[in-house]
Interface confidence: medium
Amino acid sequence: VPPGEDSKDVAAPHRQPLTSSERIDKQIRYILDGISALRKETCNKSNMCESSKEALAENNLNLPKMAEKDGCFQSGFNEETCLVKIITGLLEFEVYLEYLQNRFESSEEQARAVQMSTKVLIQFLQKKAKNLDAITTPDPTTNASLLTKLQAQNQWLQDMTTHLILRSFKEFLQSSLRALRQM
């Protein structure tokens, strides 16, 4: 349930037990469309998309990234390792998606939908990986303090953080999409 909402506002989902690859593919493409809309607002509002100072802000963030060892790339592809990485990465992105809430004016619904749709995607992938126990969930206390820290940044850093989260999340999802199509 999004922050500040009553659960009665949300139609509780009853998802089918089996989630096809096509459905997961569609869910990711749907989230990517949402990210595009959010990036459009971010880029229109500030010059962050052309900024060369990304490295300054990137040092503050520990955004999930795909690496060779994760087994998601064509070379050294490993279905199990990769699936664990995708789920773990999405779980780690959740705190950053929480940060994005209230960061948008004309795209408020898109920001909330990206967050909600990511939760659903995680559910789908967890079903697919039901026999994998190597998935670690981020510590809620650590997430809470990270969120507080991000929200306490100055305006320029907050804008840069928003831009970096969207860019990294887009790249992570695109890599995930390519990898999941191999599974």
């Epitope: 999004p2 500040g4 909402e5 009553d6 009665k8 506002d9 949300v10 139609a11 989902p13 998802r15 089918q16 459905r23 569609k26 493409r29 749907y30 469309d33 949402g34 809309a37 004016e105 004309s106 408020e108 619904e109 898109q110 909330r112 939908a113 909600m116 749709s117 659903v120």
Partner: antibody
């Protein structure tokens, strides 16, 4: 309990105007996009117009563009549809509908009002 | 003409399975939602996001989507399931579109 109650319908002559209202309760109105959907007698559902949660973004079906205006007053938890230059083909039951959370591009309507009848006839 | 195509009518024997289809090019990348409408009443959401059921909707209602076709399945149709069913999605210009509706008759 979520409730949507439409009012303002009635009989109007072609070329006339009407303003529909939809009073919302039981949910955080200011955080939900809303739509108007109509249904002509014996026909299917037709989307008319939508407005985002803050009221800054609106969209309209081609059949009503330039004649109808959707608006909202979040302080009063009320959605409006101002209908001008009405035509006989606008005759329908007009429903106010709350958009669910899971979509922004493909919104679904998880709650509907009971509808208000608009008849355009001379 | 609707951008989403549904059969105008369908009959099913009590207790049997009814499958209502909804066809449209946009359904390959957009979600389909389904509504049930009984005479003189407002529509009720029965399936959203292709295959998800809101709370309070019986388990006999399920949904699926593949390519450009969405399907609403009612397994073990009951007399109270008789009514009109509409699929809904969005077109490329972000406008909401409804299918023309399917009248389901449950033969008892």
């Amino acid at each position: 309990e979520v409730q949507l109650v439409e009012s303002g319908g009635g009989l109007v002559q072609p070329g006339g105007s009407l303003r529909l209202s939809c009073a919302a309760s039981g949910f955080t109105f200011s955080r939900n996009a809303m739509s108007w959907v109509r249904q002509a007698p014996g026909k299917g559902l037709e989307w008319v117009s939508a407005i985002n949660s803050g009221g800054g973004s609106t969209s309209y079906a081609d059949s009503v563009k330039g004649r109808f205006t959707i608006s909202r007053d979040n302080a009063k938890n009320t959605l409006y549809l101002q209908m001008n230059s009405l035509k006989p083909e606008d005759t329908a039951v007009y429903y106010c509908a709350k958009e669910g959370y899971t979509g922004w591009k493909d919104p679904m309507y998880d709650y509907w009002g009971q509808g208000t009848q608009v008849t355009v006839s001379s | 003409q609707s951008a989403l195509t549904q059969p105008s009518a369908l009959s099913v024997t009590l207790g049997q399975t009814a499958k209502i289809t909804c066809q449209g090019g946009s359904l390959g990348s957009r979600y389909a939602h389904w509504y049930q409408q009984k005479p003189g009443q407002a529509p009720v959401l029965v399936i959203y996001d292709d295959d998800s059921r809101p709370s309070g909707i019986p388990e006999r209602f399920s949904g699926s989507s593949s390519g450009g076709r969405a399907t609403l399945t009612i397994s073990g149709a009951q007399a109270e399931d008789e009514g009109d069913y509409y699929c809904q999605s969005a077109d490329t210009s972000e406008h909401i579109v409804f299918g023309g509706g399917t009248h389901l008759t449950v033969l008892g």
